[in-house]
């Protein structure tokens, strides 16, 4: 098992850009400061499943 | 199916104390946040409070700040919304929703994709 | 906290239509905006994210852009469906914040 992340609670904080290192099924909510469940997209068209990239369009799609 | 359930609205006096419950089914809260957003009659939406069931963070709007606890419990998978020193202008459809995230360059793209049908709190003598 | 400033409050409109609402934040949010639909005793629901990206089942005459401070929906030829009122919120930095809401009604 891999080291635990440390989980700092800093509510309101302007500091949002720097994201925590998160786990594979994990990405950072700037909204709550913590990282949180992330869904993958999948292309309708071809079924691809990835990260989100800004200018395509994409389907949201349960992550595993 | 993603479904959330709200309960425990009704007329309270002013002073009094509500619990609403948000129920949720067909994914589990403890690692999305949940969210508490109100309308009172005739207005727009306003954000109360969320949750992130994981690790306990919470945060209020200033209106409610010091009256409202949010809660969750992960083994009933149910948030909760402990409403005390309740004012008339608290009067609202109160709902509850969950904040979905997409994984963008490992941050959220997000919104509240799910919620619930709402529940009328009235504070009234 | 950010506010989020949206306009007009309430627009008249047509079938066919081209329809864009505008919202202004206080400060930067980067592309931290949702987009809502409303309509009367029913709960919001979600149209855009990310301020440009279309959420599933979601119309593809509804479109979202913009990133900093100012955004905007745009609904490309509005149907009958489409008369409700809609929100802009912010989830860049806690809390959250709607916009003041758009209605938009039959000409």
């Known amino acids: 098992m891999g080291a635990r992340r440390l989980r700092v609670r800093s509510q309101r904080s302007r500091d949002s850009s720097v994201p925590t290192q998160c786990n594979q099924t994990e990405c950072f909510d700037p909204l709550v400061r913590n990282c949180v469940s992330c869904e993958l997209f999948h292309t309708p068209d071809t079924g691809h499943t990835s990260s989100l990239e800004p200018g395509t369009a994409l389907q949201p799609q349960e992550g595993s | 199916e993603v479904q959330l359930v709200e309960s425990g609205g009704g007329l309270v006096q002013p002073g009094g104390s509500l619990r609403l419950s948000c129920a949720a089914s067909?994914?589990?809260?403890?690692?999305?946040?949940i969210h508490w957003v109100r309308q009172a009659p005739g207005k727009g939406l306003e954000w109360v409070a969320w949750v992130l069931p994981s690790v306990g963070f919470t945060d209020y709007a200033d209106s409610v700040k010091g009256r409202f606890t949010i809660s969750a419990d992960t083994s009933k998978n149910t948030a909760y919304l402990q409403m005390n020193s309740l004012r008339a202008e608290d009067t609202a459809v109160y709902y509850c929703?969950?904040?979905?995230?997409?994984?963008?360059?490992?941050?959220?793209?997000?919104?509240?994709?799910?919620w619930g049908q709402g529940t009328l709190v009235t504070v009234s003598s | 906290d950010i506010q989020m400033t949206q306009s007009p409050s309430s627009l008249s409109a047509s079938v066919g239509d081209r329809v864009t609402i505008t919202c202004r934040a206080s400060e930067d949010i980067s592309s931290a905006v949702a987009w809502y639909q409303q309509k009367p005793g029913k709960a919001p629901k979600l149209l855009i994210f990310a301020a440009s990206f279309l959420y599933s089942g979601v119309p593809s005459r509804f479109s979202g852009s913009g990133s900093g401070t100012d955004f905007t929906l745009t609904i490309s030829s509005l149907q009958p469906e489409d008369f409700a009122t809609y929100y802009c919120?912010?989830?860049?930095?806690?809390?959250?914040?709607f916009g003041q809401g758009t209605k938009v009604e039959i000409k």
């Open positions: 919120q912010q989830s860049q930095i806690s809390p959250p914040t």
């Open positions: 929703a969950r904040r979905v995230c997409y994984n963008r360059l490992g941050v959220c793209a997000g919104g509240m994709d799910y």
């Open positions: 067909g994914f589990t809260i403890a690692s999305s946040s």
